[in-house]
Every structure is written in structure tokens, then in C-alpha cells.
């Protein structure tokens, strides 16, 4: 058992995992392909499921981070956070219950996820036992962005980060000392978790986000890959 920064003991018995309790990479569960009695997922259901899949991956990465360093209990976060320009939801983004605006919010979610991509790239090679998990989070986020872009009406309003700026930021982050790199890793995971939770709440306000279909065994469908787009 470990305790993360949020103080919660983690258990990875998420309801959309496979029977053997392994996190199933999106699109790799052959059991789902051969299940003709299931209803197809709506795009909103896929998005909801994809976010929960990524959040579960983040939870596993946080576990390793908190186990190998004391960053999760550190009080020096605010100091380090000031140097990172991590995306964050604000009232003006239209994603909260008050002042909710579907179009504005969707643009914010997509823009924020695009901005997180450089930080997710930074996370690669930052994990030992969870290397595959880090890659899965990164790839699943790319797929999520594609799903959301299909849902967005106002794609022109979405600003894509400048690749040169991102490359420069990545170099800068990788040049930090060990302590700062550990802190950066912790902060990225914490902020990304919060951003996804905020996004999930907002997306569940957007209409047809009903449950994921359940198969006869009672375990939820596990899929979502680029072939499903």
C-alpha cells in the first residue's frame, strides 16, 4: 500500500478493467471484438471511458512517483509550480456548472490536452516499472484529443502549441537537477489528473454521456483505439 499526495490508499480495481485486473490498453482487448451482443458505444461514451482509462493510468504512475520519492508530501510544490505553465480550468473557460458553455469548454479541453502533450512526452523515460503505463497514458491522450476534435464544431478556435517552443521547454525540463525533475513529474501528474477530472465533469454536462454498455459478465467494454475513430 502507498499513500499519494491526496492521501488516498490506491487500489486498482476499476470497474472497466479486465477480469485479470490488468489495465487493458485501448483497442487491445480481443474479447471485446468478438462480442456481437453488445451495443456500440456512442462517441460521448467513448470519450468518457477514454478519460477514465487515462485517469487510471495516472493513478498507477502516481503510485510509482510517491513510492520512490517524498514529493507527494512536499510543501515546496507551490514554488516549483510557478515555473510550470500547466493547463488549468478557470471560470472563464465555461466548463464549470456556473457559466457553462459547451463550445467554449470543448475548445478549452482540447487546447489544454494539446498543451499537456509536451509534459506527457517529458514523462516518458521517467518511470522504471511503469514505463509502458506512461506510454499508454501518452498514446491514449492522443486518441482522446482526436475523439474530442471530431466532437468540436469550432476547430478554428483551437490553438496548437508551437513545436519549437515545446522542444525548447522539453530540453529545459530535462536539464533540471534530479530533485526538480522528480517535483516536475509529480506536478504534471497531479495537474493532469485535475484537468481530466474537470474535463470529465464538464463532458458529463454536455448531453448524451450515458453509461458504458455492460456485457453478460458485468465487466464494461474495453476498447478505444485509432481504428475506432
Amino acid at each position: 500500500d502507498y499513500k499519494d499526495h491526496d492521501g488516498d490508499y490506491k487500489d486498482h480495481d476499476i470497474d472497466y478493467k479486465d477480469d485479470d485486473d490488468k489495465l487493458v490498453p485501448p483497442g487491445e482487448d480481443s474479447k471485446d471484438v468478438a462480442a456481437p451482443h453488445r451495443q456500440p458505444l456512442t462517441s460521448s461514451e467513448r470519450i468518457d471511458k477514454q478519460i477514465r482509462y487515462i485517469l487510471d493510468g495516472i493513478s498507477a504512475l502516481r503510485k510509482e512517483t510517491c513510492n520512490k520519492s517524498n514529493m507527494c508530501e512536499s510543501s515546496k510544490e507551490a514554488l516549483a509550480e510557478n515555473n510550470l505553465n500547466l493547463p488549468k480550468m478557470a471560470e472563464k473557460d465555461g466548463c464549470f456548472q456556473s457559466g457553462f458553455n459547451e463550445e467554449t469548454c470543448l475548445v478549452k479541453i482540447i487546447t489544454g490536452l494539446l498543451e499537456f502533450e509536451v509534459y506527457l512526452e517529458y514523462l516518458q523515460n521517467r518511470f522504471e516499472s511503469s514505463e509502458e503505463q506512461a506510454r499508454a497514458v501518452q498514446m491514449s491522450t492522443k486518441v482522446l484529443i482526436q475523439f474530442l476534435q471530431k466532437k468540436a464544431k469550432n476547430l478554428d478556435a483551437i490553438t496548437t502549441p508551437d513545436p519549437t517552443t515545446n522542444a525548447s521547454l522539453l530540453t529545459k525540463l530535462q536539464a533540471q537537477n534530479q530533485w526538480l525533475q522528480d517535483m516536475t513529474t509529480h506536478l504534471i501528474l497531479r495537474s493532469f489528473k485535475e484537468f481530466l477530472q474537470s474535463s470529465l465533469r464538464a463532458l458529463r454536462q454536455m448531453g448524451d454521456l450515458i453509461s458504458v454498455p455492460v456485457d453478460s459478465r458485468g465487466s464494461e467494454q474495453k476498447l478505444i483505439s485509432e481504428e475506432d475513430l
Epitope: D6, R52, M89, Q197, L200, R204, V212, E220
Partner: antibody, heavy 117, light 110 residues
Framework: QSVEESGGRLVTPGTPLTLTCTVS????????MSWVRQAPGKGLEWIGY?????STYYANWAKGRFTISKTSTTVDLKMTSLTTEDTATYFC???????????????WGPGTLVTVS | AYDMTQTPASVEVAMGGTVTIKCQAS??????LSWYQQKPGQPPKLLIY???TLASGVSSRFKGSGSGTEYTLTISGVECADAATYYC????????????FGGGTKVVVV
């Protein structure tokens, strides 16, 4: 970790009232918090959440009349236009959303009684 | 709106017996459901979360199950200390909600 409510008292209808939830050993930037009330002899009634991103969500019936806000160590519940129907014990509770959106309330205060008469 | 309907409102159970409490959501809540126990004069206590995961320190006599819109709390080998009111709570959606809690079930141990 502990949670304690204060500010409950006897008020007349129409009077505004603010309840305060004081937390100890809890980083409010890392936890969702909720206010729940319970009228005498009745069930639990959810009022609203304040999430780590500082967004607030309210029950349909509470919108406009109840406001939740927080500082680094307290979570306030501002109530306006109180009626006798608002007589209840008001609880503050700490939420845990360790993987997604499944807000469970794992630590509750003892409650503070508000009587509108 | 997401509404939670809990049944029965009250149930009597003999010591050592089994009691089953049901909770139905008006829309699917994707297993994001918790159960609480409340005794008179006390705040509620978290028993089960995410449908079936026992909260820290809770007896394995308490078992949660369900999916979609239908959820169940089963208490086996009932003891005197289990006499309380039990509430379900959905954690799936906090928008367009009248109450995230079910109406409660009073368990009387005879």
C-alpha cells in the same frame, strides 16, 4: 485529519447565515469537499461540492440560495432567504476522487444544527 | 436528472440473518456508487465505494454489487451493531441533480 462545522444557531426566516467547516490535516487544494444536510428524522440531502479546481456544483434546489467557497483551511456555506424547511443538521464532508469522478465522502464532521423558527 | 431510489425504506432482520438493500439510479452511473451507515446522533460513515470496494476498517460482512442503474448492499451475519440507517450515493454526476443520496433504509435488528 479532522473536519468540524460551526456557525449553526437559531435564526428567524429570511435571515442569512454562514456556516464554516474547519479542516485539520487536510490540504484543500487536493481534496473535494461537500456540504450535506439532514432535517430532523429525515434522510441525507446533498447541497453541493467544491472541487479541487475550485469549481462549485449545487443540487438543483440549492442553486442561487446557497454558496460554497473555501480558503486554505476552511470551507464556507453561505445561505440566504432561510425558511423553516431549512431547519437541519448541516454536515461538512471530505471527498476522495482517487481515479476519476467517483466522489465518495470518507470523512464527516459531527454536524452543526441550524434552526429556522 | 440523476435520481436515486432506495428500497426498502425499512427492514427487520434477525440476528445472524442477511439483509439486502437496493438502490436504483434513474440513469446509469457506471459503478460510481458508495454506501454509508448512519447511527442516531452520529454523522454517516463510509462503508463501500466504487460499488464493491470496502472502506478501511469495514467488516467483510458488508458486500456491494451491481452495475448500470441497479446496485445492492448485502449485510450477512447481521449483528446488533448493524442496526442503523443505510444510504447509497452516486458519484457519477453532480450536475442537474436533486440529491446524490438515496432516501435511506432503516435496518432494525430483532
Amino acid at each position: 485529519q479532522s473536519v468540524e462545522e460551526s456557525g449553526g444557531r437559531l435564526v428567524t426566516p429570511g435571515t442569512p447565515l454562514t456556516l464554516t467547516c474547519t479542516v485539520s490535516g487536510i490540504d484543500l487544494s487536493s481534496y473535494d469537499m461537500s456540504w450535506v444536510r439532514q432535517a430532523p428524522g429525515k434522510g441525507l440531502e446533498w447541497i453541493g461540492y467544491i472541487y479541487t479546481d475550485s469549481s462549485t456544483y449545487y443540487a438543483n434546489w440549492a442553486k442561487g440560495r446557497f454558496t460554497i467557497s473555501k480558503t486554505s483551511t476552511t470551507v464556507d456555506l453561505k445561505m440566504t432567504s432561510l425558511t423553516t424547511e431549512d431547519t437541519a443538521t448541516y454536515f461538512c464532508a471530505k471527498g476522495s476522487t482517487d481515479y476519476a469522478f467517483d466522489t465518495r465522502l470518507d470523512l464527516w464532521g459531527p454536524g452543526t444544527l441550524v434552526t429556522v423558527s | 436528472a440523476y435520481d436515486m431510489t432506495q428500497t426498502p425504506a425499512s427492514v427487520e432482520v434477525a440476528m445472524g440473518g442477511t439483509v439486502t438493500i437496493k438502490c436504483q439510479a434513474s440513469q446509469s452511473i457506471s459503478n460510481e456508487l458508495s454506501w454509508y451507515q448512519q447511527k442516531p446522533g452520529q454523522p454517516p460513515k463510509l462503508l463501500i465505494y466504487r460499488t464493491s470496494t470496502l472502506a478501511s476498517g469495514v467488516s467483510s460482512r458488508f458486500k456491494g454489487s451491481g452495475s448500470g442503474t441497479e446496485y445492492t448492499l448485502t449485510i450477512s451475519g447481521v449483528e446488533c451493531a448493524d442496526a442503523a440507517t443505510y444510504y447509497c450515493q452516486q458519484g457519477y454526476n453532480s450536475n442537474d441533480v436533486d440529491n446524490v443520496f438515496g432516501g435511506g433504509t432503516k435496518v432494525v435488528v430483532v
